[in-house]
Amino acid sequence: YDFTNCDFEKIKAAYLSTISKDLITYMSGTKSTEFNNTVSCSNRPHCLTEIQSLTFNPTAGCASLAKEMFAMKTKAALAIWCPGYSETQINATQAMKKRRKRKVTTNKCLEQVSQLQGLWRRFNRPLLKQQ
């Protein structure tokens, strides 16, 4: 999916109002927030591409993020503010329903969510050239 035509300001507002707090809640109670940045993004559409990938694509050691509250709210924000996004996700959602697994918060998941927080922070930067 090409995120170029998303309403970035609306997605930013959704992040600030709820998604950011859900990410903090997920990370709370752990000291394992000291992870190196391994994922970055160079502009807002690129950030959303990386955020989508880390949030919804199962990875080795962390297959359970898509059912988390922050993930569901991320999905809702993208569906509302990115034209045509929801249509591209129908097959992926159906495949996910068949693959429900026991929810386990692993260190790998904590690392992944830490990366997500960094990506979201980059996405939310105020852009000087647009001010």
């Epitope: 950011s20 940045n37 160079s42 502009n43 927080q117 960094g118 922070r121 939310n124 000087l128 050239k129």
Partner: antibody, heavy 121, light 111 residues
Framework: QVTLKESGPGILQPSQTLSLTCSFS??????????IGWIRLPSGKGLEWLAS???????YFNAALKSRLTISKDASKNQVFLKIASVDTADTATYYC?????????????WGQGTLVTVSA | DIVLTQSPASLAVSLGQRATISCKAS??????????MNWFQQKPGQPPKLLIY???NLVSGIPARFSGSGSGTDFTLNIHPVEEEDAATYYC?????????FGGGTKLEIE
């Protein structure tokens, strides 16, 4: 009015753990986008970024020093803490804390005046 | 970590002339058209003072003889005309990626 002040032991011996405190006012570390960074200036050398901690509790470290550094915060008391384990004479420096902000939310730079730490046998 | 290489390490410039300091980053510090590069001035016994943010934007209250330029990986600080009070050490700093990093510094002396 934003102010920051560093405090530390002044002098300590090699192999000890250095504990520094940054006390600040005029802003909250619970506010989105806010963070505190620790920086040092060794005598006769250049500025060195040590570590940072953000409003969302994410922490980042100078790669070369990461194994020796610990950073934490008490947002309710407006304080951030830095510990450096196993110090030696190369850790003698003026240590600064500074307010950092995600991107460019304002065009200001707020630093403490620094605290001199000497590591000596 | 992003490595910033500053040159020259020291610089002696006559009063009224131009001082030019270069900063090269090990990777781009640009994001969506903005360059996340700052320039600081530091004098002995004082904390660093921000001069330029976002590569080319002058901080309020800083004299217009200071200017910054560049994008991506190559950045420049110019001071013209140099005045006596500009004797100090100058640092570039990237705030694009955690952890933030500084260049090695350039000591400016006024002749």
């Amino acid at each position: 009015q934003v102010t920051l002040k560093e405090s530390g032991p002044g002098i300590l011996q090699p192999s000890q753990t250095l504990s520094l405190t940054c006390s600040f006012s005029g802003f909250s570390l619970s506010t989105y986008g806010m963070g505190i960074g620790w920086i040092r200036l060794p005598s006769g050398k250049g500025l060195e970024w040590l570590a940072s901690i953000w409003w969302d509790d994410n922490r980042y470290f100078n790669a070369a020093l990461k194994s020796r550094l610990t950073i934490s915060k008490d947002a309710s008391k407006n304080q951030v803490f830095l510990k450096i384990a196993s110090v030696d004479t190369a850790d003698t420096a003026t240590y600064y804390c500074a307010r950092i902000e995600d991107g460019y939310y304002s065009y200001h730079s707020y630093w403490g005046q620094g605290t001199l730490v000497t590591v000596s046998a | 970590d992003i490595v910033l290489t500053q040159s020259p390490a020291s610089l002696a410039v006559s009063l009224g002339q131009r001082a030019t300091i270069s900063c090269k980053a090990s990777q781009s510090v640009d994001f969506d058209g903005d360059s996340y590069m700052n320039w600081f001035q530091q004098k002995p016994g004082q904390p660093p003072k921000l001069l330029i943010y976002a590569a080319s934007n002058l901080v309020s209250g800083i004299p217009a003889r200071f200017s910054g330029s560049g994008s991506g990986t190559d950045f420049t600080l110019n001071i013209h005309p140099v005045e006596e009070e500009d004797a100090a050490t100058y640092y570039c700093q990237q705030i694009d990626e955690d952890p933030y990093t500084f260049g090695g510094g350039t000591k400016l002396e006024i002749e």
